[in-house]
């Protein structure tokens, strides 16, 4: 539709959204035997029910509870990898290190990864033209509330040593306004989580700075310590080599610092 006629500032619902969600659900449940019991039609109905006919600025975590219930999944609580502003590398890592999990390796995260969706108040229509932008329109939109809900639950489930991958190329390596900074950090359970270990991923080949000394990392350490969780930090100077060494840990070049 013409730009003026769009209700919201953000892009509209992803094309073929219902078909995509359903297809992803079927694929995921086929690949993961522990989720074979899941009825994907019911999952889609619950997903749809969370936002259809509701004003896309008045979505609540409660709206997503039926979906959360259907998507309940047990992942090894000591094998959780969080990430902030570096999704691709985090996903490449868990594709190799198969015993570790990002949120997008769970059913609900997998269903919604990279998708946008919203409805319209009082109609059963999906809005393919525009959806609310978190900054320009409203924060309680279907996509933001979904990720806040699943991220909170994912963080709450974590135990022992939790890892987080952070983007060392950004001005704020740790950003309090990111999902990690605003949701996950505050929902790690001190009685279960012993340590948060940050992996700061370097962007430049010749960048030998210790980014663990960055002021935003110190801010993260302070927040975590106040929550009675230990904090540790590692520089990943060569992300390409890092991934290579995860694939082939016996490689002779993998004994040196990466």
């Amino acid at each position: 539709v013409p730009r003026w006629r769009q209700q919201w500032s953000g892009p509209g619902t992803t094309k073929r959204f219902p078909e995509t969600v359903l297809a992803r659900c079927v694929k995921y449940t086929e690949i993961h035997p522990e989720m074979r019991h899941v009825d994907c039609q019911s999952v889609w109905d619950a997903f749809k029910g969370a936002f259809i006919s509701k004003h896309p600025c008045n979505i609540t975590e409660e709206d997503y509870q039926p979906l959360m219930k259907l998507g309940t999944q047990t992942v090894p609580c000591n094998k959780i990898l969080l990430w902030s502003r570096i999704k691709d590398l985090a996903h490449q890592f868990t594709q190799v290190q198969r015993d570790m999990f990002t949120l997008e390796d769970t059913l609900l995260g997998y269903l919604a990864d990279d998708l946008t969706w919203c409805g319209e108040f009082n109609t059963s229509k999906i809005n393919y033209q525009s959806c609310p932008d978190w900054r320009k329109d409203c924060s309680n939109n279907p996509v933001s509330v979904f990720w806040k809900t699943v991220s909170r639950r994912f963080a709450e489930a974590a135990c022992d040593v939790v890892h987080v991958m952070l983007n060392g190329s950004r001005s704020k390596i740790f950003d309090k306004n990111s999902t990690f900074g605003s949701v996950e950090v505050h929902n790690l359970q001190p009685e279960k989580v012993q340590t948060l270990e940050a992996w700061v991923i370097h962007g430049g080949r010749e960048d030998s700075r210790d980014l663990c000394q960055d002021p935003t990392i110190k801010e993260l350490e302070s927040i975590i310590s106040k929550r009675n969780i230990q904090f540790s930090c590692k520089n990943i100077y060569r992300p390409d080599k890092f991934l290579q060494c995860v694939k082939n840990p016996e490689d002779s070049s993998c004994t040196s610092e990466i």
Partner: antibody, heavy 118, light 112 residues
């Protein structure tokens, strides 16, 4: 059949105010953007204002900006146009029209005449 | 603002004969979504306007198939294959790609 019925027109002096109403029926009013369009006597059509389905977005023609306010009450299935600081050139038949989803008008009311004269 | 220009301003047609009305816009009405936001309305004497054609060539429900719309970009045409007495009135083109929405000045159709 979709019905739109305007009311509230009449004669007013320059500088005066009027509030037009448009009662909608036979469709889900709260799902549609709505427009006001006017037509001066013997002249062509001029778009005046539009409001989104939930009232969150409103746009106006430059000729009425700051003087006219479009609003809606979805619980009453009614569209409004508050017209202040009226001028002689605002004399026209005012139509409310339903947006077709792309910015055009698929249904129109019968119109209400506003006359501004001293 | 986008300016919409009609030609001719008026025409007189014998019943059963064809009629053609042209509308030009001052800029392209083609949107990046592939749609062209051009409408045709007919205002019969003493009545409100009624939608005939939307998005250049789509007939609105209940509109007789003797009406057809064509064109692209900035040049558009409304054709009536066989004019009937009930077709008299003023025909307006309108664009909705950009605010303010703008109408052409109209073409008055009369029966000979």
């Amino acid at each position: 059949e979709v019905q739109l019925v305007e009311s509230g027109g009449g004669s007013v002096q320059p500088g005066g105010s009027l509030r037009l109403s448009c009662a909608a029926s036979e469709f889900t009013f709260s799902s549609y953007w709505m427009h006001w369009v006017r037509q001066a006597p013997g002249k062509g059509l001029e778009w005046v204002a539009v409001i989104s389905y939930d009232g969150a977005k409103k746009y106006y023609a430059d000729s009425v900006k700051g003087r006219f306010t479009i609003s809606r009450d979805n619980s009453k299935n009614t569209l409004y146009l508050q017209m202040n600081s009226l001028r002689a050139e605002d004399t026209a038949v005012y139509y409310c029209a339903r947006d077709d989803g792309s910015g055009g008008f698929d249904y129109w009311g019968q119109g209400t005449l506003v006359t501004v004269s001293s | 603002d986008i300016v919409m220009t009609h030609t001719p301003l008026s025409l007189s047609v014998t019943p059963g004969q064809p009629a053609s009305i042209s509308c030009k816009s001052s800029q392209s009405l083609l949107h990046s979504d592939g749609k062209t936001y051009l409408y045709w309305y007919l205002q019969k004497p003493g009545q409100p306007p009624q939608l005939l054609i939307y998005e250049v060539s789509n007939r609105f429900s209940g509109v007789p198939d003797r009406y057809s719309g064509s064109g692209s970009g900035t040049d558009f045409t409304l054709k009536i294959s066989r004019v009937e007495a009930e077709d008299v009135g003023v025909y307006y083109c309108m664009q909705s790609i950009q605010l303010p929405l703008t109408f052409g000045g109209g073409t008055k159709l009369e029966i000979k």
